[in-house]
């Protein structure tokens, strides 16, 4: 105790009343109104607390202070007076803030503000949503994904910002009347070959396909080394002059010739260039056959060998470079007799013939098309007299009951050497080239030098043998009729060139012969 | 009647490029390559390379290679030769014309003189 | 490449007479272009395929050959025939001219 009589032990936030009370500070309070024990505590008053009477007001606070209490306007709202705190609800001049207004950039992108008392929100913009982890945040709705599905099974679904479209897949397109983006298209299959929209070489024939397409090497051409068939980038050459080279074991400058020829014009080759292509190679068979040259001096057998190589070449490159060649009929000829004529033609039913100077042939068009082959259908026919020179003293074969007919009614005809051609040797070929058992026959009228009285005539084809050469055979083949100058053959085939032969029993000096091929 | 027609001269600087076009007309434009062919004044004919219309494919020297582009355009049966990194030596008459094997170059365009001056 | 050289490079001749140049090939060739080129003029096919005339080119021309020699011949020279003469080979790539033939009036 002190002199004046002010107890000294008063607990903290108290005050003595004289030496022996004390009393709590304002804003304090104690378990009595008077302490008279140091052992007693003056505790705070939450003035803040439910049953008390401090009342600040709306829109406000209020905040328990150490013996006090202040007033403040709740988060969002402010005091018009400008003073920070207050006591009661008098002193309250809290009213609302328009964050908006405040901060325009409050909802970042995509977002635009809504105050709200005391708050604001943010309302995201269509195609937008409220990040869960930030209210605040508008971002895209990836409508693609979001399982509503909102496209045409025809189209996929393309999430752009703030909305999506709905888009024709690649190699698709909007139905007629369609839109192409908006969630009510619909597309369908866009067929690039027939519409032009593919980048197929020239080398190969588009094929369309679902959604797509692909390029497949034309008939008689194969993809190019290391590139794959029925790709869009597959590339493409020419079998026809790679296998048509000459035969082996057989030397002749001439001949090498007509092949670098041959070769040269296979090796820029392409399908516009098939009119020109064959016009050169039958040139150029043209000029070899009329100037054979060191071929000539070749054992006969050889010569046989190299006509026979001749013959099933030409076939094979010019029924190649034919399916080339633009619909319609075709007639070539020229200096040395050679001669074409060729007709192309989509599937047609019909019968066909070709007329050339020395012959003629009429056979079905249905023929000529192997099925599944999406070429045009060619038949063609080519006359080569050059090819008698070749041919000379080649042999025939019979079968075992022709030869026993003959054997009975012409007696000469085995005893006296090779038979002779009396006429042209033709060549008929097809865009198709299985050609051993026709459904329909084909007919050759040939025309050709008169036949010496009693002399057997017979319609016959080169048959090419295991041994690259060859020989004259009958089989499948029939003479209908003939006349002093023309006979008429049927043909069950087209295996190789068919051709007329007149079989002597009267030794004479071989005219020159001439050959169709 | 097979025609070539061919764009006009042009001056260029050196390192420039040029791009000079053979419009065809009177055959069918993929029958033929189209061979590009230059002659130096007072020189011979050099082959630079050929286009074939049909499918745009090309072939070239290798003297050129890299610098020589050969293009077409089938709807115009046009087709163009650009020749980039010129130098005064490309000074030339540059020719098209149409080619096969077999004919030679059969028709020839009236040459498009390229001048190549600093 | 093929290298075709063309011999003489330069000839004189006089009206009437007969010339003939010829073309050297480093391979063998199969098929031998030639052309004739006026000052100029754009260059013009003359004979093709060794010995087929172009169309319009009168029948004094001719031409033969085989693997690496070719000739070019004019059985009796006229005036317009004065020119320069090319031969071109079409038998591997790159396509190759020879240095030409200088036909002078003599």
């Known amino acids: 105790q002190d002199s004046r009589g002010c107890a000294r032990w008063c607990p903290q936030d108290s005050s003595c009343v004289n030496a022996t009370a004390c009393r709590c500070n304002p804003g304090f309070s104690s378990f009595s109104e008077i302490i008279t024990t140091p052992m007693e505590t003056c505790d705070d008053i939450n003035e803040c607390a439910t049953l008390s009477k401090v009342s600040c007001g709306k829109f406000s606070d209020c905040w328990n202070t150490e013996g006090s209490y202040d007033c403040v306007c709740s988060p969002g709202y402010e005091p018009v007076s400008g003073a920070k705190t207050f006591k009661n609800e008098s002193e309250n001049t809290c009213q609302d803030v328009d964050e908006c207004q405040q901060n325009p950039r409050l909802c970042k992108s995509y977002g635009t503000c809504v105050n709200t008392l005391g708050s604001y929100t943010c309302q995201c913009l269509p195609g937008f949503k409220l990040k869960p982890e930030d209210p605040k945040l508008c971002t895209d709705v990836n409508e693609c994904t979001s399982g509503q599905n909102p496209c045409h099974s025809s189209t996929h679904c393309l999430n752009n910002v703030g909305s999506y479209q709905c888009r024709c897949r690649p190699g698709w397109q909007p139905i007629p009347g369609s839109p192409n983006g908006p969630n009510n298209t619909v597309c369908e299959d866009v067929d690039e070959c027939s519409s032009g929209q593919h980048q197929c070489d020239s080398s190969t024939v588009c094929f369309n396909t679902v959604g797509s397409y692909s390029c497949r090497c034309r008939p008689g051409w194969k993809p190019r080394h290391g590139i794959p068939n029925n790709q869009k980038d597959t590339v493409c050459e020419d079998m026809t002059f790679s296998t048509w080279t000459p035969p082996p074991g057989v030397h002749s400058q001439t001949l090498s010739r007509f092949f670098d020829k041959v070769q040269d014009l296979g090796r820029d080759y392409k399908p516009g260039l098939a009119n020109n292509t064959i016009q050169s190679i039958l040139q150029a068979l043209d000029e070899l056959l009329e100037a054979p040259g060191d071929l000539e001096t070749l054992p006969r057998l050889q010569q046989h060998c190299v006509a026979s190589h001749l013959l099933d070449g030409l076939e094979d490159v010019l029924r190649g470079l034919s399916k080339n060649l633009s619909n319609g009929l075709l007639n070539f000829s020229y200096p040395a007799g050679t001669e074409l004529s060729l007709e192309v033609q989509k599937q047609v039913d019909r019968s066909v013939t070709l007329r050339q100077n020395q012959a003629v042939m009429q056979l079905d068009w249905n023929q000529a098309q192997k099925s599944g082959d999406p070429g045009p259908s060619v038949v063609g026919l080519v006359s080569i007299p050059g090819m008698g020179k070749l041919l000379a003293e080649a042999p025939l074969v019979l079968e075992p009951e022709k030869q026993m007919l003959l054997h009975e009614t012409h007696q000469g005809l085995l005893q006296d050497g090779s038979p002779i051609l009396l006429s042209d040797v033709i060549s008929a070929f097809l865009s198709n080239n299985d050609t051993q058992n026709l459904s329909s026959p084909v007919t050759f009228t040939f025309s050709h030098r008169s036949v010496i009285p009693r002399q057997k005539v017979l319609c016959v084809f080169w048959e090419h043998g295991q041994n690259g050469c060859g020989h004259w055979a009958t089989t499948g083949c029939s003479t209908i009729g003939t006349r002093d100058t023309s006979t008429i053959c049927r043909c069950t085939h087209l295996s190789s060139f068919a051709v007329l032969m007149a079989h002597y029993d009267v030794q004479e000096e071989d005219p020159v012969l001439t050959v169709i091929t | 009647q097979v025609q070539l027609q061919q764009s006009g001269a042009e001056v260029k600087k050196p390192g420039a490029s040029v791009k000079v076009s053979c419009k065809a007309s009177?055959?069918?434009?993929?029958?033929?390559?189209m061979q590009w062919v230059r002659q130096a004044p007072g020189q011979g004919l050099e082959w630079m390379g050929a286009?074939?219309?049909?499918?745009?494919?090309?072939r070239h020297t290798q003297k050129f290679k890299g610098r020589v582009t050969m293009t077409r355009d089938t709807s115009t049966s046009t087709v163009y030769m650009e020749l980039s990194s010129l130098r005064s030596e490309d000074t030339a008459v540059y020719y098209c014309?149409?080619?096969?094997?077999?004919?030679?170059?059969?028709?020839w365009g009236q040459g498009t003189l390229v001048t190549v001056s600093s | 490449e093929i290298v075709l050289t063309q011999s003489p490079a330069t000839m004189s001749a006089s009206p009437g007479e007969r010339v003939t140049m010829s073309c050297s090939a480093s391979?063998?060739?199969?098929?031998m272009h030639w052309y004739q080129q006026k000052s100029g003029q754009s260059p013009k096919r003359w004979i093709y395929?060794?010995?087929k005339l172009a169309s319009g080119v009168p029948a004094r021309f001719s031409g033969s050959g085989s693997g690496t020699d070719y000739t070019f011949t004019i059985s009796s020279m006229e005036p317009e025939d004065f020119a320069t003469y090319y031969c071109?080979?079409?038998?591997?790539?790159?396509?190759?001219f020879g240095g030409g033939t200088k036909l002078e009036i003599k």
């Open positions: 014309a149409r080619g096969f094997t077999a004919y030679g170059m059969d028709y």
């Open positions: 009177g055959y069918t434009f993929t029958n033929y390559w």
């Open positions: 286009v074939y219309p049909g499918d745009g494919d090309t």
């Open positions: 391979s063998s060739v199969s098929y």
């Open positions: 395929d060794t010995s």
């Open positions: 071109q080979q079409w038998s591997s790539n790159p396509l190759t």
